[in-house]
Interface confidence: low
């Protein structure tokens, strides 16, 4: 059963998943000028067992102009509502990033994929929030939302995050580390379709970040 809504919107914040629970589907969609190959998969599926999870199927697309050229890309069920999208990366040379049991990392990129990746989440999926550039995070509690099943209905928990004010120019957005949520664990497993924008976050999936000062500017 799909989650009825997107995760809650927090002013001046974005959210994303750090890993995807088994059962999550990623639609295969192509960027403009390309289309999914006729025999290609509609979606990738996160599958596995207790020790290893991976994405089944491959997204492929071909130039709209030619019939034979095969290029890789992402899927799109016709009936789906337009939602936000989540962006992540998949490891080529992993850098001390622990894998979460029962979860998949972001599928590797493919040529000519669409700019957005649309996921069908399952119950128990967690997304993490962080303030965007220029806003400071004030935590009242966990800066995350979980797709939960309650009384036969799906819902997203409310993240306890407020993004306020201007930050010093030398700092990065949302440097605070989100607290671990006691309710961020799967209960039942039903699909939720959700997507999120890209941002930086520190979680159990990521090695601890040390605060450093960098300068940002336009070229």
């Amino acid at each position: 059963e799909l989650c009825d809504d997107d995760p809650p919107e927090i002013p001046h914040a974005t959210f994303k998943a750090m890993a995807y629970k088994e059962g999550t589907m990623l639609n295969c969609e192509c960027k403009r000028g390309f289309r999914r190959i006729k025999s290609g998969s509609l979606y990738m599926l996160c599958t596995g067992n207790s020790s290893h999870s991976s994405w089944d199927n491959q997204c492929q697309c071909t130039s709209s102009a030619t019939r034979n050229t095969t290029k890789q890309v992402t899927p799109q069920p016709e009936e789906q509502k337009e939602r936000k999208t989540t962006e992540m990366q998949s490891p080529m040379q992993p850098v001390d990033q622990a894998s979460l049991p029962g979860h998949c990392r972001e599928p590797p990129p493919w040529e000519n994929e669409a700019t957005e990746r649309i996921y069908h989440f399952v119950v128990g999926q967690m997304v993490y929030y962080q303030c965007v550039q220029g806003y400071r995070a004030l935590h009242r509690g966990p800066a995350e939302s979980v797709c939960k099943m309650t009384h036969g209905k799906t819902r997203w928990t409310q993240p306890q995050l407020i993004c306020t004010g201007e930050m010093e120019t030398s700092q990065f957005p949302g440097e605070e580390k989100p607290q671990a949520s006691p309710e961020g664990r799967p209960e039942s497993e039903t699909s939720c379709l959700v997507t999120t924008t890209d941002f930086q976050i520190q979680t159990e999936m990521a090695a601890t970040m040390e605060t450093s000062i960098f300068t940002t500017e336009y070229q």
Epitope: Q89, V95, E106, E111, E116, Q133, G134, T197, D198
Partner: nanobody, 134 residues
Framework: EVQLLESGGGLVQPGGSLRLSCAAS????????IGWFRQAPGKEREGVLS????????YYADSVKGRFTISRDNPKNTVYLQLNSLRPEDTAVYYC???????????????????????????WGQGTQVTVSS
């Protein structure tokens, strides 16, 4: 196969310059932020510079500001790191890394950028050696 390949490293005298290249294959860099990192012998890998594909904005480590610059050539699927006024302490293996950027759905998300933290990047090249010595 997804690959990042660095080139352009070598031996250079203090005060000299080098231009490193990071070429991507198997995917296009259009939707990616690219970071350059370095690792000196016996030290941890550290961030040097990163650049956003969406607006060309960059992050500089304070230690290289004014000396190193980063640029990208999307049609060539390549990112460059220009190293000027090199010092012996710049000696290290230099790595490039890629991070996919989101479509920035929210109106406030247009300037969400990528800082130089290792765990923000998952695609890494094999590195190129830069040695600064007289």
């Amino acid at each position: 196969e997804v690959q990042l390949l660095e080139s352009g490293g070598g031996l250079v005298q203090p005060g000299g310059s080098l231009r490193l290249s990071c070429a991507a294959s198997g995917f296009t860099l259009d939707y990616y932020a690219i970071g350059w990192f370095r690792q000196a012998p016996g030290k941890e890998r550290e961030g040097v510079l990163s650049i956003s594909s969406t607006d060309g904005r960059t992050y500089y480590a304070d230690s290289v500001k004014g000396r190193f610059t980063i640029s990208r050539d999307n049609p060539k699927n390549t990112v460059y790191l220009q190293l000027n006024s090199l010092r012996p302490e710049d000696t290290a293996v230099y790595y490039c890394a890629a991070k996919r950027l989101g479509p920035m759905v929210h109106q406030y998300s247009l300037e969400v950028l990528t800082p130089l933290f290792l765990d923000e990047y998952d695609y890494w090249g094999q590195g190129t050696q830069v040695t600064v010595s007289s």
